[in-house]
Amino acid sequence: AVNGTSQFTCFYNSRANISCVWSQDGALQDTSCQVHAWPDRRRWNQTCELLPVSQASWACNLILGAPDSQKLTTVDIVTLRVLCREGVRWRVMAIQDFKPFENLRLMAPISLQVVHVETHRCNISWEISQASHYFERHLEFEARTLSPGHTWEEAPLLTLKQKQEWICLETLTPDTQYEFQVRVKPLQGEFTTWSPWSQPLAFRTKPAALGKDT
């Protein structure tokens, strides 16, 4: 038997992936556990193996189909269960009726690149990955720039209230190393949250021209 509090949180990436994290206080160390997805109106069901991410939490990704296929809609309800092996049988450790479009978290933006860099400014572009066509262009972004001597947590957030997959960073210091990250969020869903931050993009501003005012 397992005592202690349990938390089971899942998000839908809006296309063909449900990512889940299960935490359990009185942790089961060497037990095999999985997440099972059973939709109320689809012919498929799916399972993924929970793998440890920390002392008392496990994670896995339910792959529902090809990355850009639209596998669920607003009317789907998916019963998600955490099942752990106890001897020869499986025990239900957690269960939820999951409404995918109320629990959205998109994939992190990808393909970040420097389009143009100068002494004081830098133009950066990115792409979104596996976002549903239902959203069309109605997404918002947050971006942040890491300056020398600061932490990511100290970086001010820049908000883009539309599907703008580029940004022009200004008032930068010449010949300075920076890093840049961006994340995305749809408008839909009561429990929807920001995507993970993108992989950081490192860039360096151009040095100021010698003998010129900067």
Epitope: K71, T74, Q188
Partner: nanobody, 119 residues
Framework: QVQLVESGGGSVQTGGSLRLSCVVS????????MGWYRQVPGKQRELVAD???????KYADSVKGRFTILRDSVKNTVTLQMSSLNPEDTGVYYC?????????????WGQGTQVTVTS
Amino acid sequence: QVQLVESGGGSVQTGGSLRLSCVVSGSHFISDVMGWYRQVPGKQRELVADMADGGSAKYADSVKGRFTILRDSVKNTVTLQMSSLNPEDTGVYYCKAGLWITGRHSDYWGQGTQVTVTS
């Protein structure tokens, strides 16, 4: 402005058939589900059948094998072919569409069409 227009209701005898149609029109939208609900006096509106993207149809137990739902997501139409009708199928039938407009999802309803089955 989004509009749902239903047609095809009427009176029919027990064992007969009817075909209900609904078309969604209006400003820019994407539909992810369309279906039919019915309401009888003194009761809540209940699902008859609907069809979501991916072709998954859902039917009320009482109509399985008798009713067939067809959805054209390009023309934004949904039809309900009803056969072997009985008096319990009497009621006002409402078309419902789940529509994505400017990044948010909402449900839209038609005005309803009366179906009467007499014995």
